[in-house]
Amino acid sequence: KKVVLGKKGDTVELTCNASQKKNTQFHWKNSNQIKILGIQGLFLTKGPSKLSDRADSRKSLWDQGCFSMIIKNLKIEDSDTYICEVENKKEEVELLVFGLTANSDTHLLEGQSLTLTLESPPGSSPSVKCRSPGGKNIQGGRTISVPQLERQDSGTWTCTVSQDQKTVEFKIDIVVLAFQKASSTVYKKEGEQVEFSFPLAFTLEKLTGSGELWWQAERASSSKSWITFDLKNKEVSVKRVTQDPKLQMGKKLPLHLTLPQALPQYAGSGNLTLALEAKTGKLHQEVNLVVMRATQFQENLTCEVWGPTSPKLTLSLKLENKGATVSKQAKAVWVLNPEAGMWQCLLSDSGQVLLESNIKVVPTW
């Protein structure tokens, strides 16, 4: 007996071939011997089966001795053994219809879990193997669970259902709601304008929610809310903003914040949260601000950085076109009685300059 696997909602063609390549009498029945369709003259006739309104055949192939039955909009309960009677012989085809669906909305927040449930006909024992867009393989039976979704899980999941050495493939689009980056650091010289951007890793037709940026300045004992905002159909409107600093926010996506001046007292870490309408949980992005200041006071040239820096970062003071350099894996460096000329303060990571500030030392007579 031939086995054919089908997908719920799909269309399947059950083939039945006669040895004579000519138009002949045929009919299809289910396992209860109820006629589904057949031929009368050149006309296709339908029987009393529940399937009849979804069953069809292609007349153009009858002349080739092919008497297929096509079933549209497959249902799990269409799983059955179908009998094609042609030229005094019977051909049996077992149809097994499967459905694979996500238990919840397919738009999920990063960190949430995804469960896929397999609908299958009674008596079947299928196995399921799913592959994420990032190449992660997950196997299961009637259910498949992905406990913690990551942003790279966004995209088309391909799931293969196997039964009796036959396979059928399902594609499920999953959207992981997250920011493009988990964390970002902005490096600025004192006094410069600071731009913070929070691009989303997904697009939705309608995007509505509310958000807030909490800030923990390095010099402060506690964190404070810098700004709160609403998002309505991708339009951003500010609800409340602190007086110091007076942040500005862009009206369109991606979420964009401007700090007029980078000052040492603002250096620190922020956490932007976004709560989306009809979703439980929040999207998070961490943002860091590192501020550099180079000063000369009497005989002392100092370069300092404030904000979250890793211990492996190097801070250097270097006299332009001269070999004189002082470097430290610290947050401040200084030179006593510096030579006259243009000095560079550099914050670097393994030779890559992250931030630089120039200061001119004038000769003292």
Epitope: E13, G41, L42, F43, R58, K59, I70
Partner: antibody
């Protein structure tokens, strides 16, 4: 809701090969036959040929020697190649889904053959 | 090949008129016939299949009849959007063939 979107070169020189692809969005790819039909400017419709998801093809005997229809089920797309084109092959080419009748249809691509 | 012949090749009518288009097959095709409507610059659209079954979403002023070799498409009361070209198609055997078309114009 099934939608068909077709694409391919619109201007060819005589003796070149026409190449068109049709993307199928939504609905079932299996169980149906995926078809190419053409319509010369100001004229009627001519069936070129068809293919199913497993690669079985039927084509018009008047074009058979020049027609190749292929399918890529992983991308839900099917393609038409018509070799050695002449000015008589100038037409709007449509892709469509068939189960005895043609529905729905792609938007059509005007292919002009001119030296 | 089965030849499909439509008549008339063009017809002028007014809004509200009843219009009948006929299609004749060169051999018996039972009810393996469809009717399509095509507007300039657009793809054809299926109206009627299996000679007399109206496709979902198609207005009920369209109807089809006939079997064997002779078929008709009737529009009971013309609407402005019905002015277009109509084609019949046989699905009885390969190659599938179409009628030459009937252009329905405003009088």
């Amino acid at each position: 809701q099934v939608q068909l979107q077709q694409w391919g070169a619109g201007l060819l020189k005589p003796s070149e090969t026409l190449s068109l692809t049709c993307d199928v969005y939504g609905g079932s790819f299996s169980g149906y036959y995926w078809t190419w039909i053409r319509q010369p400017p100001g004229k009627g419709l001519e069936w070129i040929g068809e293919i199913n998801h497993s690669g079985t093809t039927n084509s018009n005997p008047s074009l058979k020697s020049r027609v190749t229809i292929s399918v890529d089920t992983s991308k839900s797309q099917f393609s038409l190649r018509l070799s050695s084109v002449t000015a008589a092959d100038t037409a709007v080419y449509f892709c469509t889904r068939e189960l005895n009748w043609f529905d729905p249809w792609g938007q059509g691509t005007l292919v002009t053959v001119s030296s | 090949d089965i030849q499909m012949t439509q008549s008339p090749s063009s017809v002028s009518a007014s809004v509200g008129d009843r219009v009948t288009i006929t299609c004749r097959a060169s051999q018996d095709i039972a009810n393996w016939l469809a009717w399509y409507q095509q507007k300039p610059g657009k793809a054809p659209q299926l109206l009627i299949y299996a000679a007399s079954s109206l496709l979902g979403g198609v207005p009920s002023r369209f109807s089809g009849s006939g079997s064997g070799a002779d078929f008709t498409l009737t529009i009971s009361s013309l609407h402005p959007e019905d002015f277009a070209t109509y084609y019949c198609q046989q699905a009885n055997s390969f190659p599938y063939t179409f009628g030459q078309g009937t252009k329905l114009e405003i009088k």
